[in-house]
């Protein structure tokens, strides 16, 4: 019988080298054996590239399209084939569907006396258009204190966050993770970075503890 696409391909770009397209088929499908997603840049004399999809659940397929650095005018034609049968034809403009890469190298520095310093790396090289457009959200939570979870919005360019250690409970562990988005490209949020764990050993000076107990 002929195959059918139940949910059309939806694609997002990391605005660097990979776009990811996901779709659902009408029934169980061996995506890599039965389907091919062809893509080609419009407006240029350019190669038609083939993406071999992977399964993403029983009826879901996902394809990772390799591209060179994206520029705003790029537009790709997309053709989904099952053998000789064209199942779906569409187009995709990466600059209008951006999901940034997740920040990396999240590190917690607790050697500053009364401050917890979190640093991470911008996931883009300096010559990428997103490099100077990323802002971040840092999520801090505690497994020891399930009621504690905070989001800190970092709206400046420097990938750092300083938190007074006194705002965290002493003697328990915390976790942090960070994600990014690019305001001027109207992107979705990136995935969260891997989380980093640290132990908050900070104790207020005696005078302050004494002051707190008497007021």
């Amino acid at each position: 019988g002929s195959m059918k696409v139940l949910q059309e391909p939806a694609c997002v770009s990391d605005y660097m080298s990979i776009s990811t397209c996901e779709w659902k088929m009408g029934g169980p499908t061996n995506c890599s054996a039965e389907l091919r997603l062809l893509y080609q840049l419009v407006f240029q004399s350019s190669e038609t590239h083939t993406c071999v999809p992977e399964n993403n659940g029983g009826v879901g397929c996902v394809c990772h399209l390799l591209m060179d650095d994206v520029v705003s005018m790029d537009n790709y034609t997309l053709d989904l084939w099952a053998g000789q049968q064209l199942l779906w034809k569409g187009s995709f403009k990466p600059s209008e569907h951006v999901k940034p890469r997740a920040p990396g190298n999240l590190t917690v520095h607790t050697n500053v006396s009364d401050t917890v310093l979190l640093t991470w790396s911008n996931p883009y090289p300096p010559d990428n258009y997103l490099y100077n457009d990323l802002t971040y959200a840092v999520n801090i939570w505690s497994e020891n204190d399930p009621a504690y979870s905070r989001i800190h919005n970092v709206t400046y360019l420097k990938p750092t966050l300083r938190i007074p250690a006194s705002t965290l409970k002493s003697g328990i562990s915390y976790r942090a993770r960070v994600r990014a988005w690019a305001q001027h490209y109207n992107t979705t949020w990136s995935e969260w970075s891997p989380s980093t764990k640290w132990y908050n050993s900070y104790r207020e000076p005696f005078e302050q503890r004494h002051h707190h107990h008497h007021h």
Partner: antibody, heavy 118, light 106 residues
């Protein structure tokens, strides 16, 4: 490492044809397109055409009627042929690898110097 | 076809100086522009594509900028190996190149 090596004649008579072979190593012709570009003192660099990884071709309209590009993936060879040569076809002819999704050239052959003269 | 006008045609400079080469397209080519370097008797080498993205292995003293019809290639702190010819190329079909800029030692 990636290499493109060209072979072909240096001197051709007017109205004859030029055949150049570009033998590649370090990558597969099933994954990359190969372009042909020529360079002459009078006209500078001119893009002539391309054979894509799937075997389809695109030609510069100015040369389409007398140009053909083909390949043998198993031998890692691309074949360039231009007919009806005239004196103003005297140039250095290059093969070059296509970079990813962009028609720009990240590796070039060493060039084949052609003189068209009787 | 889209015409590419490069300027200057030739340029003399000394090691350590900063130079800028420009390329103008006869119509909008967005960011679809590449720059190549060619040394005497050698094949061209890709420096920049998408107007500003450095190709692999290209030193950071090279930088590309511009979009639409006006583009430039800047070389900071010229090194002895930077002297040669530079070409721009657009890749709105059909591809065409600029006439080149010859960068010579002053």
């Amino acid at each position: 490492q990636v290499q493109l090596k060209q072979s072909g004649p240096g001197l051709v008579q007017p109205s004859q044809s030029l055949s150049v072979t570009c033998t590649v190593s370090g990558f597969s012709l099933t994954n990359y397109g190969v372009h042909w570009v020529r360079q002459s003192p009078g006209k500078g660099l001119e893009w002539l055409g391309v054979i894509w990884s799937g075997g389809s071709t695109d030609y510069n309209a100015a040369f389409k009627s007398r140009l053909s590009i083909s390949k043998d993936n198993s031998k890692s060879q691309v074949f360039f042929k231009m007919n009806s040569l005239q004196a103003d076809d005297t140039a250095i002819y290059y093969c070059a690898r296509n970079k990813g999704t962009r028609p720009v050239f990240d590796y070039w052959g060493q060039g084949t110097t052609l003189t068209v003269s009787s | 076809d889209i015409q590419m006008t490069q300027s200057p045609a030739s340029l003399s400079a000394s090691v350590g100086e900063t130079v800028t080469i420009t390329c103008r397209a006869s119509e909008n080519i967005y960011s679809y522009l590449a720059w190549y370097q060619q040394k005497q008797g050698k094949s061209p080498q890709l420096l920049v594509y998408n107007a500003k993205t450095l190709a692999e292995g290209v030193p950071s003293r090279f930088s590309g900028s511009g979009s639409g019809t006006q583009f430039s290639l800047k070389i900071n702190s010229l090194q002895p190996e930077d002297f040669g010819s530079y070409y721009c190329q657009h890749y709105v079909s059909p591809l065409t190149f600029g006439a080149g800029t010859k960068l010579e030692v002053k």
